[in-house]
Interface confidence: low
């Protein structure tokens, strides 16, 4: 049997566990009307703030201040286990890793904990193996190590070559920088860049509302307001209108299904992306514009930004032809809802494109390799890679760019059996419409 | 039927590097850990280290200074290097996968490789 | 590291015979958590690389004759053959498999007497 692989972030609690929170319980209110793109305006900036907060709040809580650890033996949550532990063979019980032993970071469902990372001589410990987290080495002081060669600690230069000065010294991760005197080069015949390094001490919260984050952030809502009375005058809208429907205009819109996606977890992220999405000149030429409505766009304002932009995609050669828009069957969220799917892919695309995949959807090298390391076993590599592009992106992490990566690798046939099969696991469906105004 | 095959130089001098290669046929590669046991003539068995598919690699303290073990995907391989050896490296090389789900004992073995170092 | 010590080092018995060799940690092997101990057992016969034959301690291998059992628990364990046959002459290893680096016993050679 082959171990499982990890599922999910540590911060987000693996799957989504929401409970009726109290957003969620909100009811709509009767009020003043005001118009729309102005209430969504401000949404978006207040959902920055407290994205930002949020952020912060979690990552800087100490270790005392974080949820109190589980017990040796819990059940496990939706078949899954919290960090720390690991799932029993008959998947009822959830068993503690083995302190300095080994650990798992992400609620999961493996049968056995990963082991603990050993630091290589030449290297000292930063941070013992927790349960929940694997040991961090550094290199001695006085060595580094190098992308290229990730496995040993080289030892930093002492000293500059003749008419080099030095203008960074040896560190864990680089060697000392030289520089040319006269021009300025660094030693490898770069132009050194001004690097503006910010440090924060690891004891030290942020200020979770500096002056700075303020002023952009009534900036941006500022500029955001000016675009988005511009962008619902301007024929982008009328063309978006269709998918978009009520937004701008004060009546016409269906406010209840507005208010029931603010009521789902999530949805004012989307909402949000809509809106950024939509004011993205620079990804919409005009003649891309050309899209015709479909004849009733439900649930269409629960498209994640990746999913819109494809409703400003060129017009294919047989229109026909074209794929139609996916989305969440029971109207979730659609990167969490992917992510559910994330399990059956290895089997369905071949092995050889998962690294060229996963650069297409933007992961880097070093990315690749650490969800390499992470995966417990062969299948689940491209799991833990696809986990890591969620993560990464977030909710521009859509069905649709993943779809399109593959087109673009050449993998149709991979492309294929994945539509077919988020179609028939019943998590996905075509949006409801015409054939023709079906989108990309 | 899952078979080891492991192959490499058997006669070694003193300093010299012992690379052997382990390759896995007819079974699934990921999944398990890989490694590598060594048994010098008449005495115990000694856990060298492992590996897994993505390169992730465990090694034995008394050892992992002179000790390399990569992997090879494409070719279902597995490789040991041993650097600088002496006399007390001469012993049986095994390859073996580690259980299923990754525990730490070994449910299949190569047929050993004996090594001899010698001036 | 965990030292693995087995006791004897050969033993010989008759045909039919009970054989027991015993299996002794430098430190516990039971893991409280999921109550299992993580050892091993294996035979190895000349010229041939080790057989696995029981693991958590108790768990016959598939395949591995039911004469062949495992008992025990934190620090001490023993593999018996309820009855010595012919193709039992072998070496027998525990091992630990509760932390690295992995280590075995020094083996109990099992003759016929």
């Known amino acids: 049997m082959e171990q499982r692989g990890q599922n999910a972030p540590a911060a987000s609690g693996a799957r989504k566990r929401h409970g009726p929170g109290p957003r969620e319980a909100r009811g709509a209110r009767p009020g003043p009307r005001v118009p729309k793109t102005l209430v969504l305006v401000v949404a978006a900036v207040l959902l920055l703030v407290s994205a930002e907060s949020a952020l912060i709040t979690q990552q800087d809580l100490a270790p005392q201040q974080r949820a109190a650890p589980q017990q040796k033996r819990s059940s496990p949550s939706e078949g899954l286990c919290p960090p720390g532990h690991h799932i029993s063979e008959d998947g009822r019980d959830c068993i503690s890793c083995k302190y300095g032993q080994d650990y798992s970071t992400h609620w999961n469902d493996l049968l056995f904990c990963l082991r603990c990372t050993r630091c290589d001589s030449g290297e000292v410990e930063l941070s013992p193996c927790t349960t929940t987290r694997n040991t961090v080495c550094q290199c001695e002081e006085g060595t580094f190590r190098e992308e290229d060669s990730p496995e040993m600690c080289r030892k930093c230069r002492t000293g500059c070559p003749r008419g080099m000065v030095k203008v960074g010294d040896c560190t864990p991760w680089s060697d000392i920088e030289c520089v040319h005197k006269e021009s300025g080069t660094k030693h490898s015949g770069e132009v050194p860049a001004v690097e503006e390094t910010v440090t924060s001490s690891p004891g030290t919260p942020a200020s979770p509302c500096s002056l700075s984050g303020i002023i952009i952030g009534v900036t941006v809502a500022a500029v955001v307001l000016i675009v988005a009375v511009f962008v619902c005058k301007s024929l982008l809208w009328k063309k978006v209108l269709p998918y978009l429907k009520g937004i701008c205009s004060g009546g016409g819109g269906d406010p209840e299904r507005v208010d029931r996606s603010s009521q789902r977890p999530g949805a004012e992220d989307n909402v949000l992306n809509e809106i950024v999405s939509i004011l993205q000149p620079t990804q919409v030429p005009e003649q891309e514009m050309e899209v015709q409505e479909p004849a009733e766009p439900t649930g269409v304002n629960m498209l994640s930004p990746g999913e819109s932009e494809h409703l400003l995609e060129p017009a294919e050669a047989e229109r026909s032809q074209r794929r139609r828009l996916l989305v969440p069957a029971n109207e979730g969220d659609p990167t969490e809802t992917l992510r559910q799917c994330f399990d059956d892919f290895a089997d369905l695309v071949p092995f050889d494109s998962w690294e060229p995949l996963m650069r297409k959807l933007g992961l880097m090298d070093n990315e690749i390799k650490v969800a390499k390391a992470e995966a417990a076993g062969h299948r689940d590599t491209l799991y833990t890679m696809l986990i890591k592009w969620v993560n990464k992106t977030g909710r521009d992490a859509s069905v649709h760019t993943l779809l399109d990566a593959l087109e673009t690798l050449g993998e149709r046939l991979a492309k294929q059996k994945i539509e077919d099969h988020l179609l028939s696991s019943g998590k996905f469906m075509y949006l409801e419409g015409n054939a023709d105004s079906a989108m990309s | 039927q899952v078979q080891l095959q492991q192959w490499g130089a058997r006669l070694l001098k003193p300093s010299e590097t012992l690379s052997l290669t382990c390759a896995v046929y007819g079974g699934s590669f990921s999944g398990y850990y890989w490694s590598w046991i060594r048994q010098p003539p008449g005495k115990g068995l000694e856990w060298i280290g492992e590996?897994?598919?993505?390169?992730?690699?465990n090694y034995n303290p008394s050892l992992k200074s002179r000790v390399t073990i990569s992997v090879d995907t494409s070719k279902n391989q597995f490789s040991l290097k041993l650097r600088s050896v002496t006399a007390a490296d001469t012993a049986v090389y095994y390859c073996?996968?580690?259980?299923?789900?990754?525990?730490?004992?070994?449910?299949?073995w190569g047929r050993g490789t004996l090594v001899t170092v010698s001036s | 590291d965990i030292v693995m010590t087995q006791s004897p080092d050969s033993l010989a018995v008759s045909l039919g015979e009970r054989a027991t060799i015993n299996c002794k940690s430098s430190q516990s092997v039971l893991h409280s958590s999921n109550n299992k101990n993580y050892l091993v057992w294996y035979q190895q016969k000349p010229g041939q690389p080790p057989k696995l034959l029981i693991y958590w301690a108790s768990t016959r291998e598939s395949g591995v004759p039911d004469r062949f059992s495992g008992s025990g628990s934190g620090t001490d364990f023993t593999l018996t053959i309820s009855s010595l046959q012919a193709e039992d002459v072998a070496v027998y290893y525990c091992?630990?498999?509760?932390?690295?680096?992995?280590?075995f016993g020094g083996g109990t050679k099992v003759e016929i007497k």
């Open positions: 590996i897994n598919h993505s390169g992730s690699t």
């Open positions: 073996a996968r580690g259980g299923s789900s990754g525990y730490w004992y070994f449910d299949l």
């Open positions: 091992q630990q498999y509760y932390s690295t680096p992995l280590t």
